[in-house]
C-alpha cells in the first residue's frame, strides 16, 4: 500500500520571535528513504530540515526519531522571523540506488503566517 504523508494543519500563525510546530506523520517507513521538510515547491524549493543526522539551526525534531517505528516527523522552528513565512511541505523519499533519492509522497503543505510582534 502506498505511504501517506499527513500534515493536519493547513496553516499556522506565529508571532515573530516565537516558536511554532509543523506537524507531519507518515503511515509507513517503507520503502526506506529519508523524510525532509521544504519551503516552497518546484525547482526553487528550499530544504528546511532533513531527518538524516545533519544539524539545522533553529529547527529540531519534536518526537524521538531514533525509535525504529517512529512515524512522527514533526518539527519545531524557533525564533521565527518574517523570512520564515511560506508553505512548508513534509516529503517522503525512497533512497536511490547510485542515483539521487526519489520523492514518492508529499504532505498537503502547511502555510506559516508570521505576525508582527
Amino acid at each position: 500500500t502506498e505511504v501517506k504523508v499527513t500534515q493536519p494543519e493547513k496553516s499556522v500563525s506565529v508571532a515573530a520571535g516565537d516558536s511554532t510546530i509543523l506537524n507531519c506523520t507518515v503511515t509507513s517507513l517503507l520503502p526506506v528513504g529519508p523524510i525532509r521538510w521544504y519551503r516552497g515547491v518546484g525547482q526553487s524549493r528550499l530544504l528546511i530540515y532533513s531527518f538524516t543526522g545533519e544539524h539545522f539551526p533553529r529547527i529540531r525534531n519534536v518526537s524521538d526519531t531514533t525509535k525504529r517505528n517512529n512515524m512522527d516527523f514533526s518539527i519545531r522552528i524557533s525564533n521565527v522571523t518574517p523570512e520564515d513565512a511560506g508553505t512548508y511541505y513534509c516529503v517522503k523519499f525512497q533512497r536511490g540506488s547510485s542515483e539521487p533519492d526519489t520523492e514518492i509522497q508529499s504532505g498537503g503543505g502547511t502555510e506559516v503566517y508570521v505576525l508582527a510582534k
Epitope: 520503502p31 526506506v32 543526522g53 524521538d64 531514533t66
Partner: antibody, heavy 118, light 109 residues
Framework: EVQLVESGGGVVQPGGSLRLSCAAS????????MSWVRQAPGKGLEWVAG????????YYPASVKGRFTISRDNSKNTLYLQMNSLRAEDTAVYYC???????????WGQGTLVTVSS | SYELTQPPSVSVSPGQTARITCSGG??????YAWYQQKPGQAPVTLIY???KRPSNIPERFSGSSSGTTVTLTISGVQAEDEADYYC???????????FGGGTQLTVLG
C-alpha cells in the same frame, strides 16, 4: 572525538548473569540510538540489542530476547547490557556501537570479552 | 547462519581493485553498511547508508548498490587493506541489524 569504552566482561558460569557497561564521550549521547554487537571467537559479527535515544524503545534478535536487556542512563552517558541465563554460546567479545540516523553503526568501542564456562 | 550473503574470501594483488558483494536483503526495506576488521581489533565503519563514507576513511573505499546486491569496492588495494570485511544492514521491516558472514581479503605478494 567520539569514544566508547566497554567494561564489565569476565568469566561467568552457565546460567549466570553479567552486566556490561559502555561509557560514551565526545558526542551528545542523549541524541543517539545505541546498540550492542558481539563476536564469538573466530566467528562473525552478531547484533544483540538496540535502544532508542530516549531509552523507551528496545530491540532484540530472537537469539537473546527474554535473556538480555539493554538500557541507558543519559545523565551518566552510559549504555548497559544486562545478560541473564548465560549459555556457552554467548561467549564473545561484546562491542557497543553508536547508531546513525538509519540504525547502521558509525562508531565502535574496543570491546569487552565475556566467557561463559563452568 | 547469516541473513546476508558475501563471499568467504577475495584475493587481489597490490594496486588492483577488489570488489566484495553482499546480497540477501530486500532493497525496499534495507540500508547497508560495510565494516572493516583487522585481527584483534574492533570493527571500523567504512561505508554507511549504502554509499556514504566517513570523513576519516580513504577515498579508495566506495560503496554502491544495484537491485538487491551491494558492493564494496577498494581501488588501488594496499597491503594494509588485508582484513575481514563485513556487510551489515538495517532491516526496517523487522527492526533488526543482520550481518553477512564476513569476507577475508588477502593482498597477494
Amino acid at each position: 572525538e567520539v569514544q566508547l569504552v566497554e567494561s564489565g566482561g569476565g568469566v561467568v558460569q552457565p546460567g549466570g548473569s553479567l552486566r556490561l557497561s559502555c561509557a560514551a564521550s565526545g558526542f551528545t549521547f542523549s541524541s543517539n540510538a545505541m546498540s550492542w554487537v558481539r563476536q564469538a571467537p573466530g566467528k562473525g559479527l552478531e547484533w544483540v540489542a538496540g535502544i532508542s535515544a530516549g531509552g523507551s524503545d528496545t530491540y532484540y534478535p530472537a537469539s537473546v530476547k527474554g535473556r538480555f536487556t539493554i538500557s541507558r542512563d543519559n545523565s551518566k552517558n552510559t549504555l548497559y547490557l544486562q545478560m541473564n541465563s548465560l549459555r556457552a554460546e554467548d561467549t564473545a567479545v561484546y562491542y557497543c556501537a553508536r547508531e546513525t540516523w538509519n540504525h547502521l553503526f558509525d562508531y565502535w568501542g574496543q570491546g569487552t570479552l565475556v566467557t561463559v564456562s563452568s | 547462519s547469516y541473513e546476508l550473503t558475501q563471499p568467504p574470501s577475495v584475493s587481489v594483488s597490490p594496486g588492483q581493485t577488489a570488489r566484495i558483494t553482499c546480497s540477501g536483503g530486500s532493497y525496499s526495506s534495507y540500508y547497508y553498511a560495510w565494516y572493516q576488521q583487522k585481527p584483534g581489533q574492533a570493527p571500523v565503519t567504512l561505508i554507511y547508508s549504502d554509499d556514504k563514507r566517513p570523513s576519516n576513511i580513504p577515498e579508495r573505499f566506495s560503496g554502491s548498490s544495484s537491485g538487491t546486491t551491494v558492493t564494496l569496492t577498494i581501488s588501488g588495494v594496499q597491503a594494509e587493506d588485508e582484513a575481514d570485511y563485513y556487510c551489515g544492514g538495517y532491516d526496517q521491516s523487522s527492526y533488526t541489524n543482520p550481518f553477512g558472514g564476513g569476507t577475508q581479503l588477502t593482498v597477494l605478494g
